[in-house]
Interface confidence: low
């Protein structure tokens, strides 16, 4: 028999051993041109010595076969001998060692068996209903197709799934999603309605990332406020990598998570934009204002859980950057000013409500006045810190207000509002002796000392009735005692004590009346 | 053309069972996946459960932990045990093959049987 043709003799071997768990196997074979074919399959076991013989029997009844070597792959034409219109059932023979093995048969029509290809470009992934939606263009002129998805974990070996029968110009494919760990699949397609044709390549990888994106565990730290106003915000811990399959490691699209920085600048709530998104990797410079960070993961399926985390606002207060001047129109505030054109947000919070929401109010952009300073005014029907309260007055600066990450800390203070002077007299003043010639003289803390950096000094005032003579006595704003000395004995004294704020002169407490008693000896 | 008769529906107090059968007119060895659909009145036809000739099951969350389908190839049938029953799984109950584009079906759907939850 010529070689490129089927020889309808027997075969030089003895009948085949079909029950090995060796041999000829998966089988397939189809058209790759208008007259030509070509058969291929696998041998599982030593191949030293082994010969292959592919044998086919016709409709009629009538066998022959093609003996092929060691190799496992065949070409024919359609003048070989093997009628290519009408069903023809093929097998493997194997021989080696006096021993034949036999691979299962396939019956087909060898000229409508066309090689299928995998699916090719694009495949959508979607969800539905919990599992895994794969769709794709079916391949030009294959149309009606049988599919096999395979589908591996990092930690898992591939496992095999049906798809089902396609009939369409598209083609999909549901499958298992996991909840937790990121997938590889790979698609196959072949004829469909007949069992024996051969299945296409495997498709190139689909990266399939975990349905729940991966908890960000990221750390931040905020550096000190600079002179600037600003601080940044650094990441310590970066998110960690999700873990991929063997065949999506590298550039593989699809299972990526992307990492995003919400920041939410809970201060100065009257501004235009409270929230921004932006990439991890662009770590911002933040003002001294407080905020809520949220690091939001996402994949191909959208948002996943988010870590938030709270950053207070810098305390550090400078007592001495603001001027205050009240006047009978109203109040202005005088800071330092920065940039042409900056607008400022001046916030202010009685002491002690830190949890309900600051009142605030943002200026028109404004350039510096003759003496560099920035200014923002009030009437006194405005109400604003008209209460004679601690308030805590921070300004943020920005020549760029709708940008969130481009404000900075101008000062953060305390101011007490309403009439300080009187608010501020220091009550329960009392006199106790202390020696011959000395008393001690204690009050009721101001309320100005509930501000902190306000009360600059406490002023003791001591008249002696007799002489008129007036002494004054500067105590320390954190001290509410004093001890009057050289005293005279039989004199009649008054004391009166007030309350001193950088800016402001206090009144005077309710005059006290004191002498100490002549000491008349036995 | 493969016939489907389900049966085994009924009325059952709340959190009762029943367990429903599907008998398909020939072999559904090969059919990949298998469903089971309900439609209350008024109402959409929902998806519910589905098995694929391997034994994978899937379920829609309404009635994940409750519902349990499988699948006898030798004996052409598919089933789906329903425990836990609520009201609202008042409906008619129909299997069919399942598709990627649910409610695309290849067969024609079969008459249901109807599963009524009330004390």
């Known amino acids: 028999c010529r070689t490129s043709e089927c020889c309808f003799q027997d075969p030089p071997y003895s009948d085949a051993d079909s029950g090995s768990a060796s041999g000829p196997r998966d089988l397939s074979c189809y058209r790759i041109s208008s007259a030509g074919y070509e058969c291929s399959w696998q041998y599982e076991g030593p191949t030293a010595g082994v010969s292959h013989f592919l044998r086919c029997c016709l409709s009629s009844g009538r066998c022959c076969y093609f003996a092929t070597g060691s190799a496992t792959r065949l070409q024919f034409s359609d003048q070989a001998g093997v009628s290519v219109l009408h069903t023809v059932t093929l097998w493997v023979e194997s021989w080696a060692r006096n021993r034949t093995e036999k691979s299962p048969e396939v019956t087909l029509q060898l000229y409508k068996s066309v090689k299928y290809k995998p699916p090719l470009g694009d495949i959508k992934v979607s969800k539905l209903a919990g599992q895994l939606r794969m769709e794709w263009e079916t391949p030009d002129n294959q149309v009606g197709a049988e599919v096999q998805f395979r589908h591996r974990t990092p930690s898992s070996s591939w496992k095999l799934g049906d798809c089902g029968p396609q009939d369409d110009d598209t083609e999909s494919c549901l499958c298992p999603l996991e909840m937790n760990v990121a997938q590889e699949f790979q698609l196959r397609r072949r004829r469909l309605g007949s069992q024996g044709s051969s299945w296409s390549k495997w498709s190139s990888p689909v990266c399939v990332p975990p349905e729940n994106p991966p908890q960000p565990q990221v750390r931040f730290s905020v550096e000190q406020l600079g002179r600037d106003g600003r601080r940044r915000l650094t990441l310590k811990e970066q998110p960690t990598q999700l873990e991929l399959p063997e065949g999506c490691q590298g550039p593989a699209p699809g299972v990526e998570v992307t990492y995003q920085l919400q920041l939410h600048m809970l201060s100065c709530p009257c501004k235009a934009k409270a929230t921004r998104t932006l990439p991890l990797e662009k770590m911002p410079y933040l003002s001294g204002a407080a905020y809520n960070v949220a690091v939001i993961s996402s994949n191909r399926f959208g948002p996943g859980p988010n870590q938030t985390w709270h950053i207070p606002a810098d305390t550090h207060t400078e007592p001495v950057a603001l001027n205050i001047s009240v006047g009978t129109n109203g109040t202005t505030m005088y800071w330092p000013a920065r940039a042409q054109s900056t607008t400022y947000c001046i916030e202010w919070q009685p002491v002690g409500q830190e949890g309900s929401l600051a009142t605030c109010n943002l200026t028109a952009p404004q350039d510096p006045d003759p003496a560099g300073m920035a200014t923002y005014s009030w009437s006194r029907e405005s109400g604003a810190m008209g209460q004679e309260k601690c308030y805590h007055i921070t300004i943020f600066a920005s020549a760029h207000p709708k940008k969130l990450t481009l404000w900075s800390t101008v000062l953060s203070t305390y101011h007490f509002g309403g009439n300080a002077s009187a608010a501020g007299t220091p009550h329960h003043v009392s006199v106790k002796n202390h020696s011959l010639d000395s008393v001690s003289v204690d009050w009721a803390p101001s309320l100005l000392s509930t501000c902190p950096g306000v009360l600059k000094e406490y002023v003791v005032r001591c008249r002696d009735e007799d002489s008129n003579q007036v002494s004054e006595h500067p105590v320390q704003p954190t001290e509410t005692q004093v001890t009057l000395s050289d005293l005279r004995a039989g004199v009649a004294y008054t004391v009166q004590v007030r309350a001193d704020t950088a800016w402001l002169r206090g009144a005077w407490s309710q005059p006290q009346r004191f002498s100490i008693k002549v000491q008349v000896s036995d | 053309e493969v016939q489907l008769v389900e049966s085994g529906g009924g009325l059952v107090q709340p959190g009762g069972s029943l367990r429903l059968f599907c008998a398909a007119s020939?072999?559904?060895?090969?059919?990949?996946?298998m469903g089971w659909y309900r439609q209350a009145p008024g109402k959409q036809r929902e998806w519910l459960a589905s098995?694929?000739?391997?034994?994978?099951?899937f379920y829609a969350d309404s009635v994940k932990d409750r519902f349990t389908i499988s699948r006898d190839s030798v004996k052409n049938t598919v089933y789906l045990q329903m425990n836990s029953l609520k009201p609202e799984d008042t409906a008619a109950y129909y299997c069919?093959?399942?598709?990627?584009?649910?409610?695309?079906?290849?067969?024609?759907w079969g008459q249901g049987t109807l599963v009524t939850v009330s004390s």
């Open positions: 069919n093959r399942y598709r990627s584009v649910p409610l695309n079906t290849v067969y024609p």
């Open positions: 020939r072999s559904i060895f090969n059919i990949n996946i």
């Open positions: 098995i694929t000739s391997g034994g994978s099951t």
